[in-house]
């Protein structure tokens, strides 16, 4: 019964970018300007989202899709659809309630959102330090110290791998 | 409409005050943190100060510890600014916003912004 009495809808046959208006007979009518519908039997049309203050339109609304926005810059998107917008720290950073703050000592942040987190503790692996972490930068771990035994090839990491100031362990 | 709408900037001299407010309409004011950021000729916003939905809690960045005093009234749905000692590094305009939900637990997103309000630091 459901499927006979849509087929009989005169609304179904409205495509998206319009609404079945049932001020005009039902007929299909275009979205208004700053609305849209993205599928079709619509009976009304949706308000599009406005990229104000904080955010800017990454894409504009059109009749069949809403605004996407982005953060203006020195923020960054959070939640379901970029809804709100956080500020940016630097790396080696973390935003508290007291604002961006260094990362504690052990501790690292190597992007401009995000906590903090410790550094690899490469003795959980049977490993070695083979270079200091930083606050941006997390340890980089190298061989067993029984494989750095007299004739044992030892590794060596790509030189941008080194810290300025921090000499392996 | 969710609103907010920033008054009380202008023109001050070094050493002097200034009290800027934030009206909000179209949501339950008192459930939100609220905050202020700026942003001076040329660079980017910044993070002044923000204050828990029962103003319990407030925070400041460093650079305004001492002189700048926010503050709310969540029967007047507004959110306020105090300036005192006044420096030409604090010329900006003046931007208050909402926390967004869960602001401070898991995060410290803003959702919603003012126009803004010029504050300016000249003799």
């Known amino acids: 019964f459901e499927r006979t009495r849509s087929l009989q809808d005169p609304c179904s046959n409205c495509p998206a970018g319009t609404f079945c208006d049932n001020n005009r007979n039902q007929i299909c009518s275009p979205c208004p300007p700053n609305s849209f519908s993205s599928a079709g039997g619509q009976r009304t049309c949706d308000i599009c989202r406005q990229c104000k203050g904080v955010f800017r339109t990454r894409k504009e609304c059109s009749s069949t899709s809403n605004a996407e926005c982005d953060c203006t810059p020195g923020f960054h998107c959070l939640g379901a659809g970029c809804s709100m917008c956080e500020q940016d720290c630097k790396q080696g950073q973390e935003l508290t309630k007291k604002g961006c703050k260094d990362c504690c000592f052990g501790t690292f942040n190597d992007q401009k959102r995000g906590i903090c987190r410790p550094w690899t503790n490469c003795s959980l692996d049977g490993k070695s330090v083979l270079v200091n972490g930083t606050k941006e930068r997390d340890v980089v771990c190298g061989p067993s110290p029984a494989d750095l035994s007299p004739g044992a090839s030892s590794v060596t990491p790509p030189a941008p791998a080194r810290e300025p100031g921090h000499s392996p362990q | 409409e969710v609103q907010l709408v920033e008054s009380g900037g202008g023109l001050v001299q070094p050493g002097g005050s200034l009290r800027l407010s934030c009206a909000a309409s179209g949501f339950t004011f008192s459930s939100h943190w609220m905050t202020w950021f700026r942003q001076a000729p040329g660079k980017g916003l910044e993070w002044v100060a923000h204050?828990?939905?029962?103003?319990?809690?407030?925070y400041y960045v460093d650079s305004v510890k001492g002189r700048f005093t926010i503050s709310r009234d969540n029967a007047k749905n507004s959110l306020y600014l105090q300036m005192n000692s006044l420096r030409a590094e604090d010329t900006a305009v003046y931007y208050c916003?909402?926390?967004?939900?869960?602001?401070?637990?898991?995060?410290?997103?803003?959702?919603?912004w003012g126009q803004g309000t010029t504050v300016t630091v000249s003799s």
């Open positions: 916003a909402r926390g967004g939900d869960g602001y401070s637990d898991s995060h410290f997103g803003v959702d919603v």
């Open positions: 204050i828990k939905e029962g103003g319990s809690e407030k």
